[in-house]
Interface confidence: low
């Protein structure tokens, strides 16, 4: 009988694991893939039929300190004539990411992971029509 | 690392950057359960630049599943359901941070990893290059 492929068998804690104080975890902030860059098409936020603006929020006690949020410019979508078509809807597309927050209590510093919902851009959708009986 | 203002009366106050290794309380704040975008909205189907969601799975990562958007068409979908190739469906990309177990399999040791994900698609007017 063919034995199934075992992806990971890590039931015993490896001896090489670093010691971690109670109530916390060790986090290496040296980021894997630090230098990779977004390669989106140019100026899509202004060329989109559901265009958006960017707002940069900056917090020196957060990593990354800059978080960019998008806001849809219109409720409707831009048609071929460059006018807003309110029979369609511009809606935000969102993505969750982790951030690392640094907290100060007097001279002691603690670190906390947070999940942040980032609005990445907007897309044009057909509205959901609710028919009233 | 990032610069951090500190109380000048504290020891080592010249250390303004994030240390390379930190101990973190992993009570993740603001955590909600919208890890599956199919559950959170149906925009991927209703968009004029619709997309499919592909699952990227890695048990050594937190979260272990990340959804990648792939635009269904080169063009955009018109009101009649046909594709308009005078417009382009393009992916919207975002860098996100995830946790990677490092060393592998260790229970409470992680490293931050930056991942580039396509979150959805949007319909854009194409850039027209005029040839002289």
């Amino acid at each position: 009988r063919k034995i199934p492929k075992v992806g990971h068998t890590f039931f015993q804690k490896p001896e090489s694991c670093p010691p971690v104080p109670e109530g916390s975890m060790k986090l290496d902030t040296g980021i894997i893939n630090e230098n990779q860059r977004v390669s989106m098409s140019r100026n899509i936020e202004s060329r989109s039929t559901s265009p958006w603006n960017y707002t940069v929020t900056w917090d020196p006690n957060r990593y990354p300190s800059e978080v960019v949020q998008a806001q849809c410019k219109h409720l409707g979508c831009i048609n071929a004539q460059g006018k807003e078509d309110i029979s369609m809807n511009s809606v935000p597309i969102q993505q969750e990411t982790l951030v690392l927050r640094r907290k100060h209590q007097g001279c002691s510093v603690s670190f906390q992971l947070e999940k942040v919902l980032v609005t990445v851009g907007c897309t044009c959708v057909t509205p959901v029509v609710h028919h009233v009986q | 690392g990032i610069a951090i203002p500190r109380n000048s009366g504290c020891p080592n106050s010249e250390d303004k950057n994030f240390p390379r290794t930190v101990m973190v309380n992993l009570n993740i704040h603001n955590r909600n359960t919208s890890t599956n975008p199919k559950r959170s909205s149906d925009y991927y189907n209703r968009s004029t630049s619709p997309w499919n969601l592909h699952r990227n799975e890695d048990p050594e990562r937190y979260p272990s599943v990340i959804w990648e958007a792939k635009c269904r068409h080169l063009g955009c979908v018109k009101a009649d359901g046909n594709v308009d190739y005078h417009m382009n469906s393009v992916p919207i990309q975002q860098e996100i941070l995830v946790l990677r177990r490092e060393p592998r399999h260790c229970p409470n040791s992680f490293r931050l990893e930056k991942i580039l994900v396509s979150v959805g698609c949007t319909c854009v007017t194409p850039i027209v290059h005029h040839v002289a």
Partner: antibody
Amino acid sequence: EVQLLESGGGLVQPGGSLRLSCAASGFTFSSYAMNWVRQAPGKGLEWVSTISGRGGSIYYADSVKGRFTISRDNSKNTLYLQMNSLRAEDTAVYYCAKEEATWDFDYWGQGTTVTVSS
Amino acid sequence: EIVLTQSPATLSLSPGERATLSCRASQSVSSFLAWFQQKPGQAPRLLIYDASNRATGIPARFSGSGSGTDFTLTISSLEPEDFAVYYCQQRSNWPPTFGQGTKVEIK
């Protein structure tokens, strides 16, 4: 609505075999890791095995390693547990549980009873 | 493997009272800890994930707290349907492990 329905349990003699199935509906089955968890009569819960969404990663508890095999058929939305060389201590209610991306067992089936006795 | 110890084994309370259940881990599990409720003849139901987050559809009277090795499940005011067995479970390390359970019974 997420539904998980286990089947295949029954009475078997020590050394015998059984194959449990878990039929899933209400979610995209191939997108989620799945688990088997068991509960001996009057006892607590014990994790048995995990299989990732595409089946590339498989995990077993030491107590069943080499005897049990987890598998899945994503075209049939079904999870399986092949149990060989059964022992009296394998007697339990076996539950299948869906796993969220963030490692939570968010939905469970109602369980199927396996009794190993001579 | 990580051992989870729940206390007390049994909690005898009346409806309307506050229930406090404890779960202690043999080593830090960060906040990768969940709480489940199980009624006789039924499957477990996820109540709390990541130590303090209520799962979908779980009433606000259930709350979780703690991180590292010490965790608490609190039921602010017991309803008749809350009398059941409660299990904690960790996913910080393989294998996933459960506590032995705390039975909340009617006094």
